[in-house]
Interface confidence: low
């Protein structure tokens, strides 16, 4: 089955700058600004565009050692990024993949809204564990806040 979870979160960072840092340079930023959450990001294949495979490794103590993400779409004009978790982590007997869509929308106050859709593709009639959805949401939120803090402290970066 397919289980869809949608969420919105806001940021004080302008959309274009946030897309540049959080989406386009997340591979470099995440281990730097949130080493407690992501220990490394390794490019397995591709140049960052659709089809690119990345291996995201987690610190010791996490329930999962790594996940592999596949980039599905990068829209620099509309600040959209689609990717799928295809291996490692929760992917296995009951879960086939997780398709994620992130869209960053500018707000009148100069900040932005992140619209996030997570589609869990389960095998057979298996359901999604609430704990997994929560964990994924918390991971995203913490990475976002870490990047946000970095950008606020480094006003010259990613402009």
């Amino acid at each position: 089955g397919v289980f869809n979870y949608e969420t919105e979160t806001t940021s004080v960072i302008p959309a274009a700058r946030l897309f540049k840092a959080f989406i386009l340079d997340g591979d470099n930023l995440f281990p730097k600004v949130a080493p407690q959450a992501i220990s490394s990001v390794e490019n397995i294949e591709g140049n960052g565009g659709p089809g690119t495979i990345k291996k995201i490794s987690f610190p010791e103590g996490f329930p999962f050692k790594y996940v592999k993400d596949r980039v599905d779409e990068v829209d620099h004009t509309n600040f959209k990024y689609n990717y799928s978790v295809i291996e490692g982590g929760p992917i296995g007997d009951t879960l086939e993949k997780i398709s994620n869509e992130i869209k960053i929308v500018a707000t009148p106050d100069g900040g932005s809204i992140l619209k996030i859709s997570n589609k869990y593709h389960t095998k057979g009639d298996h359901e999604v564990k609430a704990e997994q959805v929560k964990a994924s949401k918390e991971m995203g939120e913490t990475l976002l806040r870490a990047v946000e803090s970095y950008l606020l402290a480094h006003s010259d970066a990613y402009n």
């Epitope: 407690q36 103590g61 996490f62 329930p63 964990a135 918390e138 803090s149």
Partner: antibody, heavy 127, light 111 residues
């Protein structure tokens, strides 16, 4: 440098109140659960309370429930412990400590221990 | 509530020799995700506590590899492969599976 600094301790009469503060620096304060732990003179460590990174979830030890209140100001990177109806047995050194990385709830998948501690502040409850 | 019991209360040690401290919980600390929610802390004389081991066996950042955590469920052990003079202090285990609670502590001192 990652650090926590407690303040606000002092001498207070039984039944009185005191508010402790713990100021964080060197890390993204709002991403971490924070704890209060105390140590009575010559005794062991006693966990007092914790609060989630976003301040929405708090838990207290039975010994302080209903009398102590933990809160945080993520803009000022400060943790608070409001202590009311103080008793002689609350006399202790109070430490704040950084807990798990997380944002909204007590999520067990991301637990790294209490890895940063403050120097402690002394609370004496006596008439 | 989960009760944590440590032994021994006091442990005289010889530098260079191994040492071990036991910690027992009144309920299993093994979570369904496979991790044991038990930490070990050391409080050196006149100092704040410091984290040694989390999740039963994971050494915290900067902790020497002579320290190791072992055990699962209700029985846990902190081992020091070769005690050094700087290791003196009170060692505490702590469970975080439910509302956190510490063991009573084990005082390690040089013979």
């Amino acid at each position: 440098e990652v650090q926590l600094v407690e303040s606000g301790g002092g001498l207070v009469q039984p039944g009185g109140s005191l508010r402790l503060s713990c100021t964080a620096s060197g890390f993204t304060f709002s991403s971490y659960m924070t704890h209060w732990v105390r140590q009575a003179p010559g005794k062991g460590l006693e966990w007092v309370s914790h609060i989630s990174g976003d301040g929405t979830n708090t838990t207290y030890a039975d010994t302080v429930k209903g009398r102590f209140f933990t809160s945080r100001d993520n803009v000022k990177n400060t943790l608070f412990l409001q202590m009311d109806s103080l008793r002689a047995e609350d006399t202790a050194v109070y430490f704040c400590a950084r807990g798990s990385w997380y944002t909204t709830g007590w999520h067990r998948n991301y637990y790294f221990g209490m890895d940063v501690w403050g120097q402690g502040t002394t609370v004496t409850v006596s008439s | 509530d989960i009760v944590m019991t440590q032994s021994p209360l006091s442990l005289p040690v010889t530098p260079g020799e191994p040492a071990s401290i036991s910690c027992r919980s009144s309920q299993s600390l093994l979570h369904s995700n496979g991790y044991n929610y038990l930490d070990w802390y050391l409080q050196k004389p006149g100092r704040s506590p410091q984290l040694l081991i989390y999740l039963g066996s994971h050494r915290a950042s900067g902790v020497p590899d002579r320290f190791s955590g072992d055990g699962s469920g209700t029985d846990f052990t902190l081992k020091i492969s070769r005690v050094e003079a700087e290791d003196v202090g009170v060692y505490y285990c702590m469970q975080v599976l439910q509302t956190p609670s510490f063991g009573g502590g084990t005082k390690v001192e040089i013979k």
